[in-house]
Interface confidence: medium
């Protein structure tokens, strides 16, 4: 694993360029956004200190037939080397605790930029 | 304090152009999403447009009566916030008003156009 | 291109409650905001995310939505609530604003 601040990600560390098209393409899908993203589906929560890419993707990997993440869903699956299945990261799990998609594409949101500006992927 | 002042405005003939500034100070710029509203004399406000931050891509929109003859772009390093206006016509004269659209959408929330700045009138006239 | 429309004006008598609607297509999907405007000055921000209420905005201020009709509600309006309100949302895309044609509110 390449650890970075925290958050692990199995791999070579995304390009910058890459990581700047997938922020903007969360906020794409969460502006201004107040109905409830891919029909209210939930997600397992994870630890985004010590997940990463593959975790994340594991995790939007139970939600399907929701056009409005797919996008998101090919971008993180561009930063993970190998195939991910359903339920592969489970010990990353918090506490079998699930949340809305919209609320976890706004925590990863929140924590690429925070790694972005810290300079985690310059 | 977050504070934001708009100058530049002045009589321009039809088919002349102007630009605006928006000097920011009291919070960081650089997070801020920032838009461009204008108010034509006795008139409702108009959106006119729209620029994100660089960290969120950058992206800028404009509403489709200024599209093409408006620019909007930003200088983080000097704090200040652009409307370059070309082609103007008659109908663009109103005072114009940059605004904060996302003070605190970094970290995840959303005020709407929560600061203003005091508007700059641009007169569009022969 | 997408609209909000607000009724041009409205009129209530101190004490009295004001309601001012905004309706547009994409209320359902997206939030609206309150401007309100007093003459000569910049518009100041009294509700956002169709509910809540910035620090410094009077409790009298609230906003509700449903389906495509967002609501500000002044309770027990006062003369210095006199003043035009903008609603303002964004298009289905989320990536163009707009304004409604404001609503003149008059406390008599």
């Known amino acids: 694993l390449t650890c970075l601040g925290g958050f692990a990600s199995p791999g070579p560390v995304p390009p910058s360029t890459a990581l700047r098209e997938l922020i903007e393409e969360l906020v794409n899908i969460t502006q201004n956004q107040k109905a409830p993203l891919c029909n209210g589906s939930m997600v397992w929560s994870i630890n985004l200190t010590a997940g990463g890419f593959c975790v994340a993707l594991d995790s939007l990997t139970n939600v399907s037939g929701c056009s409005a993440i797919e996008k998101t869903q090919r971008m993180l699956s561009g930063f993970c080397p190998h195939k991910v299945s359903a339920g592969q990261f489970s010990s990353l799990h918090v506490r079998d605790t699930k949340i809305e998609v919209a609320q976890f594409v706004k925590d990863l949101l929140l924590h690429l930029k925070k790694l972005f500006r810290e300079g985690q992927f310059n | 304090e977050v504070q934001l002042v708009e100058s530049g405005g002045g009589l321009v003939k039809p088919g002349g152009s102007l630009r605006l500034s928006c000097a920011a100070s009291?919070?960081?710029?650089?997070?801020?999403?920032m838009s461009w509203v204008r108010q034509a004399p006795g008139k409702g406000l108009e959106w006119v447009g729209r620029?994100?931050?660089?960290?969120?891509?950058?992206?800028?929109n404009y509403a489709a009566p200024v599209k093409g003859r408006f620019t909007i772009s930003r200088d983080d390093s000097k704090n200040t916030l652009y409307l370059q206006m070309n082609s103007l016509k008659t109908e663009d004269t109103a005072v114009y008003y940059c605004?904060?659209?996302?003070?605190?959408?970094?970290?995840?929330?959303?005020?709407?156009?929560?600061?203003w700045g005091q508007g700059t009138l641009v007169t569009v006239s022969s | 291109s997408y609209e909000l429309t607000q009724p041009p004006s409205v009129s209530v008598s101190p004490g009295q409650t004001a309601r001012i609607t905004c309706s547009g297509d994409?209320?359902?999907?997206?939030?609206a905001y309150w401007y309100q405007q007093k003459s000569g000055q910049a518009p100041v921000l009294v509700i956002y995310?169709?509910?809540k209420r910035p620090s410094g905005i009077p409790e009298r201020f609230s906003g509700s939505s449903s389906g495509t009709m967002a609501t500000l509600t002044i309770s027990g309006a006062q003369v210095e609530d006199e003043a035009d309100y903008y609603c303002?949302?964004?298009?289905?895309?989320?990536?163009?604003?707009?304004f409604g044609g404001g609503t003149k509110l008059t406390v008599l």
């Open positions: 605004a904060t659209d996302q003070v605190g959408a970094y970290y995840g929330d959303y005020y709407g156009m929560d600061v």
């Open positions: 994409a209320l359902p999907e997206k939030y």
């Open positions: 303002y949302s964004t298009d289905s895309s989320g990536n163009h604003g707009v």
């Open positions: 995310e169709d509910t």
């Open positions: 009291g919070f960081t710029f650089s997070n801020a999403w």
């Open positions: 620029i994100r931050s660089k960290i969120d891509g950058g992206t800028i």
